[in-house]
């Protein structure tokens, strides 16, 4: 039966679609030809297209596809985005709230030991932000650098105040001291091992979020096949080539093509879902000493009670001290005077009231209750892709690659397609490079996220409050504790419930596609807004 | 492999000084503290005190002024002495190494122990 | 000072079971705790350091816990060499002190 002849017999809708695409009509036959030049849209009969066309099909059809790609993942891509840069805004300011914490403890309990122990204390919680960001720096190194920094401070100002000036030359002797005699005892190893843990988990948090996004962008980026451009123009422009410019490719042909295009992005399947669920099993961990918040907002209470027992075991010491370092004769040391207002950010010990309460730990939870909602992500990419594209409902008279037809079958269609392109070698060619690329570093960080020791996800008790403490107990697990009894000091029972000093007033609506991050306003007091609540098909 | 062997009298007299050795092999003394614990007949262990890698010592407060810990870190040998015995100090005595290095200048729980020293004192 | 109470006094089991012991601190110890065996004329082994983690070459069915200020031990299986007496210590601050101890004897 002979192909039905091009409606228009002067290709004339043909002309003026293709001349959006490309101006002028050079390249475009003023009658139907027969087209035995062209690669992609081989005709059954005359046709309106030539080989320059066809290029330029297959060019736009990529480009298509990229599009439809990046608008596909947009809504994921800025998801994580913002939540990175919050949560990396939200750390610093935590770590700076610990460091006001302390040094106003300084102040308010041993003001003779300022302003050295500023300079320390700040020292101490430079290197915190850095190791958080990723800084290659040693958690035991800088607790114990602090321990060493504050003690010579202690010697000569609270134990032995009555040293005479050319007794303050014995820096290096009482920091040796200071090791030898455990003159904290075990308030180092007990800090240690509660700052490790809690920050090696933020930055590990971190770390997955900003791989989130290479993921995203990596995904988004993608350059496609000649062999998919030439599979996409088949179904989206070679029914022009007939003049048949209002049908609609199939449904389950678009769903064919796109699995054979997408064959390498699915591949990160298994894997994304397994970021997703490991990120899961990571902040459903974070909490009590694995929840940096928790650890450093209470460190200004430990560090107290380290000093305390220095001052308990005085007596002892002194003397063990006076005969350790009775001849150094080290360099004088002379810390310069900084006014003390210069280390305590005031706004920040204001109690802040906050209306919407919201903890970072909820704000945790929420970000992986929205991830959790993309798990299927890249699997539902391709039906995704050809929702948000032009198809026939029901496979119902619509464009199969070839011709049109009055219902779609998808072996008719393969047949068909073997002597153009094999749809098979397509998908056995494998993931590109770049796709290999992040699936190595997505694997990577799942081991790490996996092998993060960490309590194994979170039963709260009933009399237990939202994070999971009880008024003067540890709740389950001694190993979850913050130490520190604090007598006589502020207790910082709710975490910074602030974000306040981090308002992003984002709608998702108004965001672009990009990587524009958000930036906290100067307000005082203010809470997180939502992210609007974008509903996609891929959820 | 790790050893700590130690070397005393097993007979005491009363008010008399008690010393005993405790020589160290397989780990520097320079990197591990070595207490002193004791076991008195049918009863449970008794923590006497400690001397760190860096030659600070601890003592348990009740021992304090007749109890002296030192060492020597060339011969990998650890030296107690305890005065003033009495009846009641009849007991196993115990050397025991933890973990002392320049890591966390803590505390930390004693992984190596000595064969025990079964201190009598009697006249 | 702390002191370490150690329960029971002692206890009688068969090889297989499983047994518990368990540690209550005076204060906050912060899981600063050791377990040790102590077999029948010898010295004392270290089973358990920081509440939960266990000493090198001990066998996987013995197992450290901790809650608050109470610490437990747990041993699954019993087995023959497993029954002497079962000491706490703490060493989270000088003095450092044991527990009673929990002899475990076979039924």
């Known amino acids: 039966q002979p192909p039905p002849p091009p409606p228009d017999a002067t290709c004339h809708q043909v002309r003026s679609f293709f001349q959006r695409l490309q101006p002028g009509l050079k390249w475009v036959p003023e009658t139907p030809v027969p087209g035995s030049d062209l690669q992609v849209c081989l005709p059954k009969g005359p046709t309106c297209c030539s080989r320059k066309m066809e290029e330029k099909y297959q060019l736009t059809a990529r480009l298509n596809m990229e599009q439809l790609l990046q608008s596909a993942s947009m809504e994921l891509k800025f998801l994580i985005i913002q939540n990175a840069a919050v949560f990396q805004e939200a750390f610093e300011i935590v770590v700076r709230h610990a460091k006001n914490y302390t040094n106003a403890m300084f102040k308010n309990n041993y003001p003779s030991l300022t302003p050295q122990a500023f300079e320390f204390v700040g020292e101490f919680f430079t290197d915190v932000s850095l190791y958080i960001l990723g800084s290659d720096i040693n958690v035991d190194d800088m607790v114990n650098e602090l321990f060493d920094s504050l003690f010579p401070v202690i010697y000569t100002q609270l134990m032995n105040p009555g040293l005479p000036d050319s007794a303050l030359d014995i820096n290096e002797c009482l920091r040796g001291a200071r090791r030898d005699l455990k003159v904290f005892g075990n308030f180092p190893k007990l800090i240690m091992t509660q700052v490790s843990k809690s920050l090696q988990v933020t930055r590990i948090f971190l770390q997955a979020l900003n791989l989130g996004i290479e993921v995203i962008n990596t995904t988004d980026h993608l350059k496609f096949s000649k062999d998919c451009g030439r599979m996409l123009t088949r179904m989206w422009y070679c029914s022009y080539c007939q003049g048949l410019m209002m049908v609609k490719p199939c449904g389950g042909y678009c769903n064919v093509v796109m699995q054979g295009c997408m064959a390498g992005v699915v591949e990160i399947d298994k894997y994304w879902r397994e970021y997703i669920l490991s990120l899961e099993e990571l902040v459903n961990g974070m909490y009590r000493i694995y929840d940096m918040e928790n650890v450093l907002l209470g460190l200004f209470s430990t560090i107290h009670d380290s000093i305390q027992y220095v001052q308990k075991n005085a007596g002892k010491l002194t003397t063990t001290i006076g005969k350790l370092c009775a001849h150094s004769q080290q360099r004088q040391y002379r810390s310069a005077y900084y006014p003390e207002d210069l280390f305590i950010d005031k706004k920040v010990l204001k109690v802040a009231h906050v209306e919407h309460e919201e903890t970072l730990s909820s704000r945790r939870r929420e970000l992986i209750q929205k991830l959790k909602s993309f798990i299927s992500f890249y699997s539902a990419l391709p039906g995704y892709i050809c929702s948000h594209s032009p198809v026939a409902e029901n496979d119902t008279l619509c464009w199969n690659g070839q011709e049109l037809v009055e219902r779609y079958s998808q072996k008719a269609a393969r047949n068909g397609m073997k002597n153009q392109f094999n749809l098979h070698e397509l998908k056995m060619k494998g993931p590109e490079p770049v796709v290999s690329q992040i699936i190595d570093k997505l694997k990577h960080i799942n081991q790490l996220l996996r092998t993060m020791s960490m309590p194994k996800g979170r039963v709260l008790d009933k009399n237990l409050d939202e994070e999971g403490f009880e008024s003067g107990d540890c709740g389950d697990d001694e190993d979850e504790c913050i130490g520190g009894s604090g007598d006589g000091m502020i207790k910082v029972k709710n975490q910074l419930r602030f974000l306040a000093e981090l308002a992003y007033d984002l709608d998702v609506d108004d965001a672009p596609g990009n990587s524009q991050q958000a930036t906290p306003k100067d307000n005082e007091i203010s809470t997180f807004h939502n992210l609007g609540n974008v509903h996609s098909p891929l959820k | 492999q790790v050893q700590l062997k130690q070397s005393g009298p097993g007979l005491v007299q009363p008010s008399q000084s008690l010393s005993i050795t405790c020589t160290v092999s397989g780990f520097s003394l320079n990197n591990y503290g070595i207490n002193w614990v004791r076991q008195s007949p049918g009863k449970g262990l008794e923590w006497l005190g400690v001397?760190?890698?860096?030659?600070?010592?601890d003592y348990n407060a009740p021992f304090i002024s007749r109890l002296s810990i030192s060492k020597d870190n060339s011969k990998s040998q650890v030296f107690f002495k305890m005065s003033s015995l009495q009846v009641d100090d009849t007991a196993i005595y115990y050397c025991?190494?933890?973990?002392?290095?320049?890591?966390?200048?803590?505390?930390?729980?004693?992984?190596?122990w000595g064969q025990g020293t079964s201190v009598t004192v009697s006249s | 000072d702390f002191q370490m109470t150690q329960s029971p006094a002692s206890l009688s089991a068969s090889v297989g079971e499983t047994v518990t012991f368990t540690c209550r601190a005076s204060g906050d110890i912060h899981n600063f705790l050791a377990w040790y065996q102590q077999r029948q004329g010898k010295s004392p082994q270290l089973l358990v350091y920081n509440a939960k983690t266990l000493a090198d070459g001990v066998p996987s069915r013995f197992s450290g816990s901790a809650s608050g200020t109470q610490y437990s031990l747990k041993i699954i299986s019993l087995q023959p060499e497993d029954f002497g007496t079962y000491y706490c210590?703490?060493?989270?601050?000088?003095?450092?002190?044991f527990g009673s101890g929990t002899k475990l004897e076979i039924k």
């Open positions: 025991a190494g933890n973990p002392d290095s320049d890591h966390y200048y803590g505390y930390e729980a004693m992984d190596y």
């Open positions: 210590q703490h060493f989270w601050t000088i003095p450092f002190t």
């Open positions: 001397v760190w890698s860096g030659g600070g010592t």
